[in-house]
Amino acid sequence: VQNSCDNCQPGTFCRKYNPVCKSCPPSTFSSIGGQPNCNICRVCAGYFRFKKFCSSTHNAECECIEGFHCLGPQCTRCEKDCRPGQELTKQGCKTCSLGTFNDQNGTGVCRPWTNCSLDGRSVLKTGTTEKDVVCGPPVVSFSPSTTISVTPEGGPGGHSLQVL
């Protein structure tokens, strides 16, 4: 004989000894019908705020408050936004690799320094993790360009940037 709990919809719970579909109580949810209990809704507080409120069929979703970003599956923790010279990765904020920079506060990825030689210009001021290179005026007599090898942190090397 088929258990009538099998016919219960999401947003309800059902006990085998009394197989009646009952609505989830407030602040609980069930995304699958026929379960013996509803799950307690996630509460977004402190560094978290609600991205999606809880319903009888879906858990609440949290995001981080201004100035913080999510880490972990389903935004399990909040970390302070990255500073200039850093970019966000799965592990959190990481310093830009050699040859890249990020001048933004809190957002953005590390991007490569400008290649001054593309415009036939020299490097007036070398780049940092926070600032792009400053290109000088066009070079009149072109000397052969040299290649420097950039080895990103954790990487095998072999990325090239052209500098004059």
Epitope: E87, T89, T114, P152, P156
Partner: antibody, heavy 121, light 111 residues
Framework: QVQLQQSGAELAKPGTSVKLSCKAS????????IYWVKQRPGQGLEWIGN????????FYGEKFMGKATFTADTSSSTAYMLLGSLTPEDSAYYFC??????????????WGQGVLVTVSS | QVVLTQPKSVSTSLKSTVKLSCKLN????????VHWYQQHAGRSPTTMIY?????PDGVPDRFSGSIDSSSNSAFLTINNVQTEDDAIYFC??????????FGGGTKLTVL
Amino acid sequence: QVQLQQSGAELAKPGTSVKLSCKASGYTFTSYYIYWVKQRPGQGLEWIGNIWPGNGGTFYGEKFMGKATFTADTSSSTAYMLLGSLTPEDSAYYFCARRPDYSGDDYFDYWGQGVLVTVSS
Amino acid sequence: QVVLTQPKSVSTSLKSTVKLSCKLNSGNIGSYYVHWYQQHAGRSPTTMIYRDDKRPDGVPDRFSGSIDSSSNSAFLTINNVQTEDDAIYFCHSYDSTITPVFGGGTKLTVL
């Protein structure tokens, strides 16, 4: 909506060059990396390199240094890849793809339709 | 040199559940995000899972992603497999934030 439109198929002779284009629309071209990916028929995906169109800065995979050259024209929101000194080994599909600026290890959210380059004498 | 290893081919039956693996040879699978792409013959890849376990809009909730640090692997699970799931699946992560790495791809055959 975001789109990456690539140029048509290329048939080239060994030793020559081809220039592939990838025209972006529906977003700010200068604010996202464009990646280039190679796929030989029936094979896996291989990173060639990437360009930041905002300043023309580039990175190349070790294997593709001297083989590929990236440029970007911000006025037409188009990224280009020049493939030089072609050999039959360069016969493949070439895709351009965009990476979001959320994190340094993010996915490629939009891809071009791919270009088949065939190198044959 | 970071390598992501995927089984060359996997066969499964219609309406079953299949779990595709992507093993990192060195380093920690938790260091960088893992993403999954589906590619049908003659088409460009499309994202099925991004940032380990997130599903883009329009991707059925039959698809889910997970990370297992004990086996240093990422997994793409497909429930209630459909004929349209017959495709090649690639995993994608990073060696450094400059250097993306792809798995060799798994050809999923739906019987």
